[in-house]
């Protein structure tokens, strides 16, 4: 699908929001305001935010969004259907699963509706673009007097996801990290019994399905040691 | 203010190959979207290709699989590898570029780049 630049009817007033670029044509150019920067974030593949700075606008200014993807089946141009407000002007659109092709070139346009030469038409990998949610279930085992393993699980396809553990004993002052692969499992092979251990974990969605940069948030952090339950010392999903 | 500058155009055969480079002065492009764009006589400047500043590349649809968009951030340049040139390829090719915020904006409008260059002409003949 060809981008096509709409042509203003002749009625703007052209001396409002106007200034000079060095654009390569045989007369000097002149070209409008720049539009804000759309950034897109693609949350467990369940549903996108784009969203722009509304407030970087000269007026207070309803701008829409059209998208289409490139070479694809789903190159129609489509309307933002679910547009995200901040102080009753348009921030941003939501769009849901079914709308979303993480593997096909996603084409972005936001436009000022009373001044149509002002538009500007971004490109995004959405595949690079996903957020997982937080892992969630976080568990301990005890593998031996002195190993422990965290398990934990995520709401998405797990070999898509690498994952950052930090844990630390209450009497560090900084955390301790590891990378760990899609294999969403753990072990700290020497324990130290008389102190407390906290336990914490993000994901991203990098590198076999994608390569985000944005990790999730934090899952809750869970603990194990000297203050922990005594019945079971062998198994312990405590959340703080 | 980024000056742009581009080289490396000249006339080729068709199925031939050329490398545009367009040489940045004044700032690093390092946080800068960047584009490139062609002219032929008597048409619409369109979009050829355009990157991020993070590293993703894009393509217009008659140039995807023949043309390379690539950057040196330390040179300050960016580049087109253009391969299988074909006449309808003859034309003024432009190296654009914009300050972005974000390291996954890539414009492939040309009226959101604020910086161009002079041009460099290509010629493909059969």
């Known amino acids: 699908l060809n981008t096509t630049i709409l042509t203003p009817n002749g009625n703007e007033d052209t001396t409002a929001d106007f200034f000079l670029t060095t654009m390569p044509t045989d007369s000097l150019s002149v070209s409008t305001l720049p539009l804000p920067e759309v950034q897109c974030f693609v949350f467990n593949v369940e549903y996108m935010n784009c969203t722009w700075n509304s407030s970087s606008e000269p007026q207070p200014t309803n701008l829409t969004l059209h998208y289409w993807y490139k070479n694809s089946d789903n190159d129609k141009v489509q309307k933002c259907s679910h547009y995200l407000f901040s102080e009753e002007i348009t921030s941003g659109c939501q769009l849901q699963k079914k709308e979303i092709h993480l593997y096909q070139t996603f084409v972005v346009q936001l436009q000022d509706p009373r001044e149509p030469r002002r538009q500007a038409t971004q490109m995004l990998k959405l595949q690079n673009l996903v957020i997982p949610w937080a892992p969630e279930n976080l568990t301990l085992h005890k593998l031996s007097e002195s190993q422990l393993e965290l398990n934990w699980n995520n709401r998405f396809l797990n070999h898509c996801l690498e994952h950052l553990v930090q844990y630390r004993t209450d009497w560090d002052h900084s955390w301790t990290e590891q990378s760990v692969d899609y294999r969403h499992k753990f072990s700290l092979p020497s324990v130290d019994g008389q102190k407390r251990y906290t336990f914490r974990v993000r994901s991203r969605f990098n590198p076999l399905c994608g390569s985000a940069q944005h990790w999730s948030e934090w899952s809750h952090p869970i603990h194990w040691g000297s203050n922990t339950s005594k019945e079971n010392p062998f198994l312990f999903a405590l959340e703080a | 203010q980024v000056q742009l500058q581009e080289s490396g155009g000249g006339l080729v055969q068709a199925g031939g190959s050329l490398r545009l480079s367009c040489a940045a002065s004044?700032?690093?492009?390092?946080?800068?979207?960047m584009g490139w764009f062609r002219q032929a006589p008597g048409k619409e400047r369109e979009f050829v290709a355009c990157d991020s500043w993070g590293g993703d590349t894009f393509y217009a649809d008659s140039v995807e699989g023949r043309f390379t968009f690539s950057r040196d951030n330390a040179k300050n340049a960016t580049y087109l590898q253009m391969n299988s040139l074909q006449p309808e390829d003859t034309a003024v090719y432009y190296c654009?570029?914009?300050?972005?915020?974000?390291?996954?904006?890539?414009?492939?409008?040309?009226?959101?780049?604020?910086?161009w260059g002079q041009g460099t002409q290509v010629t493909v003949s059969l």
């Open positions: 654009a570029g914009a300050p972005t915020s974000f390291a996954t904006t890539a414009y492939s409008s040309s009226n959101s780049y604020t910086v």
């Open positions: 004044g700032r690093t492009l390092s946080r800068y979207a």
